[in-house]
């Protein structure tokens, strides 16, 4: 189905800029540049450019962000759940019992028969069957520190409800810490909010697995539904070929620009405004960093006899098994332009606009 | 560039199926389907049944979150900055000052004046300059909620830092609530994280336009620099096309699979391992809907004459102005397996396996 | 081509003992789990016992447990049922058969013509 | 054990009848049902398993359905070659168990 061309780099980038002459004048609903007739002369306001900056800022702290997906979360990974230790066990009685918290203990051999190593862990998730509550309730979820101190994790607010429900607490860092350190019995704390007026808060949801006396009565629903740690890991089998095999690149701006990369990558192009699109309107930037996507992602036909070779190719040229696998942008940036209408100048974000990795998709 | 031909779709089910057989193994690291000979006979056991159901709970919490960004998030966006009301007003006079607490009101006359309608606000993100801080501090941010009630936001870890920095919160529901309601003063609390054992929690962060007492002085680097909200909304003539225009369509199967569409859009594909590649060695699910994205994204050409016209067919049709736009999966969703390696049976998810939406990219 | 011949039945008094042997061909047989089914003359099939593709896991019916022992040669493509203190009721012909043990339905999808073991005195 | 019933045991039909063979489970079984045919002298050959999905190269003509306890195969136009002895099998638990058959006959 694919026909192999020589590709005219000079057109498509010529595309790229006239596609990016409609896409700016299309997102400001502007069916022709602005006329500049009333443009004050001199600099932009300093408030104007204390606002643009404070816009650039944002999209800067936000677009160090995104990482690329690391090889390893293409691969399959492997479900364990752990249960809580029971609460007869000796551990629960070191902790107080109280009105504003429950505590949940986790046996870390179980865990690392689960995940050996902690580089192996790709999401762990705190899972507590909620039963019924009356009323609106914020509650904290603490990781046990050190001897007899908690670290504050993340909160909720649970709406009230009739029905039992399962809540989720994202623990990734917390398991992967465990794994890694020596302890034998590692926990976590459920707590009511208290905020530093009011300090009378009690935690009112009753937990699956606990009384209301914060203790014991497993039976409550059922054994099997005491709160428990969802793993996702690489099995270990499978993560030597991680560090041997090649690894999937990034292909972003890193990679691509010092390379010679045929396949799909992130090609780089300026956009002058004045230059390249013949426009003097946009008083900030004077261009940006567009780049664009480009090079054959092909298809592989995995009934090929060189299967175990066929299949390593996967995860770069065709990792959504797409019948025509496409290069296209994966990470994406906004751009903030100065410009004026009329004598007003407006500071304007416009979203998706610089290409900072591909993929095929 | 292009050239139009017609889509053999049996061909391209059958790429896709073929490509989703090789996806397969590879994220499973397998070179071929695994033997069957060690499976004992029999429904899976129980424990492994409800950690797969554990699983597919949690792609069904997950999956229902992330919406495809509406047709707005593609124009541009006007920026503003509303400055907090300066310390001196006398509604700071209402809130008694605390070790804990600093308090930031706005006037929502501003707010109006630079976003008419709540509906218009795309994002509000609340800027505070923190000057250094010698410790590491847990704060909480609070909305005013009725006279002298106040409603948890959010919270964030502050480590300790020599230089200042802008810290920013997303406030936009907040900002929102504020445009619909008639209020003249609203406000923020920034608090010390109190937990329910530990209350003597004191703010040790400086926040710029505050002294170390929590009132005045904002000369403190600069009047600018006080605690801002800074806007991000769709100008109100801009507006009026968004009622107007035909919406920018979600791409998705609720769309998809009830339309006639001939451009980009996802197509329905359910594959039923045992019947479309032959497999019975995946146990659970015995299929699933992966679905796959058909159909051309037309390449525009801004010169053209029908230049409005043409402008709006960008958001549609490529809104990523590629020099070549192409149909590809927008939303994803993982798949739950469950499968035996020898006696074992393994539960392993397998990412971005489902196409749930599709777009030009 | 695919296909099970079983041999080694006869005549045997009870008590006896008999090793009957099935030899396979055509398919990757230690990918496969293998049993087998017996019927007695005029009656209906019943299942006697079946081993995973290493060997590693064996299954009996109750009726010969303890007295027959199902094993496997998977460099020989061989399987063998060990039948000891023999009855009656045991005389039947015997099937191999192979089991297609995917997603734990075990169904016998490949089956011999069958050897007949009479057990009298 | 689970035991395996099977009804009709004998059943006399023309060619291009419709014909329902039924089989119950005395506990539920799942979908863990599969079915054979066999002739005279001859091994039994399988025609549907997991309940309901239809062994390759048997003819469409042979179909399955149920789950739970009970289960049906159905021969939607009899042919002269399906006059034969039918039997279900379950594969829920060890030790896996026949029905006693059911001898279809020329009418």
């Known amino acids: 189905l694919s026909t192999c061309k020589t590709i005219d780099m000079e057109l498509v980038k010529r595309k790229r800029i006239e596609a990016i002459r409609g896409q700016i004048l299309s997102k400001l609903r502007l069916a022709s540049p602005p006329s500049q007739g009333e443009v004050p002369p001199g600099p932009l306001p300093e408030a104007v450019l204390a606002l643009y900056n404070s816009t650039r800022d944002r999209v800067a702290g936000e677009s160090a962000e995104p990482e690329p997906e690391p090889e390893a979360d293409y691969y399959a990974k492997e479900v364990t759940r752990v249960l809580m230790v029971e609460t007869h066990n000796e551990i629960y009685d070191k902790f107080k019992q109280s009105t504003h918290s429950i505590y949940m203990f986790f046996n870390t051999s179980e865990l690392r028969e689960a995940v050996p190593e902690p580089v192996l862990l790709s999401r762990a998730e705190l899972r507590l069957l909620r039963l019924k509550l009356k009323v609106e309730q914020h509650v904290e979820l603490y990781q046990k520190y050190s001897n007899n101190s908690w670290r504050y994790l993340s909160n909720r607010l649970l709406a009230p409800s009739d029905s039992p429900e399962w809540l989720s607490f994202d623990v990734t860092g917390v398991v992967r810490q465990w794994l890694s350190r020596g302890g034998e019995i590692e926990g976590f704390r459920l707590s009511a909010h208290c905020s530093c007026d009011s300090r009378d808060n009690t935690l009112q949801v009753d937990i699956n697995g606990f009384t209301t006396g914060r203790r014991g009565d497993l039976a409550t629903i059922h054994g099997m539904n005491r709160p428990f740690l969802l793993l996702m890991a690489t099995p270990l089998e499978r993560a030597q070929h991680l560090q041997s095999s090649r690894h999937r690149r990034a292909l972003d701006t890193n990679y691509c620009f010092s390379s010679t990369e045929k396949n799909c990558c992130v090609r780089q192009l300026y956009i002058d405004f004045r230059k390249d699109l013949g426009w003097k309107w946009i008083h900030e930037p004077k261009g940006y960093h567009a780049n664009f996507c480009l090079g054959p992602c092909p298809y592989i036909w995995s009934l090929d006899t060189q299967y175990s070779k066929v299949l390593a190719l996967y995860n770069q040229h065709n990792p959504g098994a797409s019948a025509a696998p496409c290069c296209v942008p994966q990470a994406l940036e906004p751009l903030p332009i100065v410009y004026y209408v009329g004598r007003k100048p407006k500071v304007e974000q416009l979203s998706n606009m610089i290409v900072r990795s591909c993929k095929c998709s | 560039l292009s050239t139009c031909k017609t889509i053999d779709m049996e061909l391209v089910k059958r790429k896709r199926i073929e490509a989703i057989r090789g996806q397969i193994l590879s994220k499973l690291r397998l070179a071929s389907p695994p033997s069957q000979g060690e499976v004992p006979p029999g429904p899976l056991p129980e424990a492994v049944l409800a950690l797969y159901n554990s699983t597919r709970d949690r792609v069904a919490g997950e999956s229902a979150e992330p919406e495809p960004e509406p047709e707005a998030d593609y124009y541009a966006k006007e920026v503003t900055r509303v400055l907090m009301v300066e310390t001196h007003n006398e509604i700071y006079d209402k809130f008694k000052q605390s070790t804990h607490s600093i308090y930031m009101f706005f006037n929502t006359s501003e707010l109006r004046e630079a976003v008419p309608e709540p509906v218009l606000l795309s994002r509000a993100e609340l800027r505070l300059l923190r000057l250094k801080l010698k410790v590491e501090q847990h704060v909480e941010l609070y909305q005013k909620y009725s006279n002298n009630s106040w409603r948890y936001l959010s919270n964030r870890l502050l480590a300790p830092s020599d230089s200042p920095e802008w810290l920013s919160f997303d406030v936009t529901g907040v900002v929102r609530q504020w445009l619909s309601r008639g209020g003249e003063i609203e406000g923020f609390r920034l608090s010390a994280h109190c937990s329910c054992d530990s209350r003597d929690n004191t703010l040790q962060v400086d926040i710029n336009g505050f002294t170390t007492g929590r009132r005045g002085d904002l000369a403190t680097i600069h009047g600018m620099n006080r605690p801002f909200l800074l806007l991000m909304a769709t100008p109100l003539e801009r507006a009026q096309h968004l009622q107007s225009s035909r919406h920018r369509r979600a791409l998705d199967t609720n769309y998809c699979f009830s339309s006639t569409e001939k451009n980009c859009c996802v197509r329905q594909l359910y594959i039923d391992f045992r019947k479309d590649l032959g497999w019975k060695w995946i146990h659970e699910p015995k299929g699933y809907h992966a679905n796959f994205c058909l159909g051309p994204c037309p390449y525009i050409w801004s010169l053209d004459t029908q230049y409005s016209k043409v402008l709006a067919l960008y958001n549609q049709h490529n809104p990523g102005a590629s020099a070549a736009p192409c149909c590809v999966p927008q939303a994803l969703e993982p798949l739950p397996i469950v499968y035996y390696v020898g006696r074992k049976p393994k539960v392993e998810q397998l990412s971005n396996m489902i196409v749930r939406s599709c777009k030009c990219s | 081509e695919v296909q099970l011949l079983e041999s080694g039945g006869g005549l045997v008094q009870p008590g006896g003992s008999l090793r009957l042997s099935c030899a396979a061909s055509?398919?990757?047989?230690?990918?496969?789990?293998m049993s087998w089914v017996r019927q007695a003359p005029g009656k209906g099939l019943e299942w006697v016992s079946a081993i995973s593709g290493s060997g590693g896991s064996t299954y009996y019916a109750d009726s010969v447990k303890g007295r027959f022992t199902i094993s496997r040669d998977n460099s020989k493509n061989t399987l063998y049922l060990q039948m000891n203190s023999l009855r009656a009721e045991d005389t039947a012909v015997y099937y191999c058969a192979r089991v297609d043990s995917s997603g734990g339905y075990w169904y016998f999808d490949l089956w011999g013509r069958g050897t007949l073991v009479t057990v009298s005195s | 054990d689970i035991q395996m019933t099977q009804s009709p045991s004998s059943l006399s039909a023309s060619v291009g009848d419709r014909v329902t063979i039924t089989c119950r489970a005395s506990?539920?079984?799942?979908?863990?049902l599969n079915w054979y045919q066999q002739k005279p002298g001859k091994a039994p050959k399988l025609l549907i398993y997991a309940a309901s999905s239809l062994q390759s190269g048997v003819p469409s003509r042979f179909s399955g359905s149920g789950s739970g306890t009970d289960f049906t195969l159905t021969i939607s136009s009899l042919q002269p070659e399906d006059f034969a002895t039918y039997y279900c099998q379950q594969s829920y638990s060890t030790p896996l168990t026949f029905g006693g058959g059911t001898k279809l006959e020329i009418k």
């Open positions: 506990q539920s079984i799942s979908s863990y």
């Open positions: 055509g398919f990757t047989f230690s990918s496969y789990a």
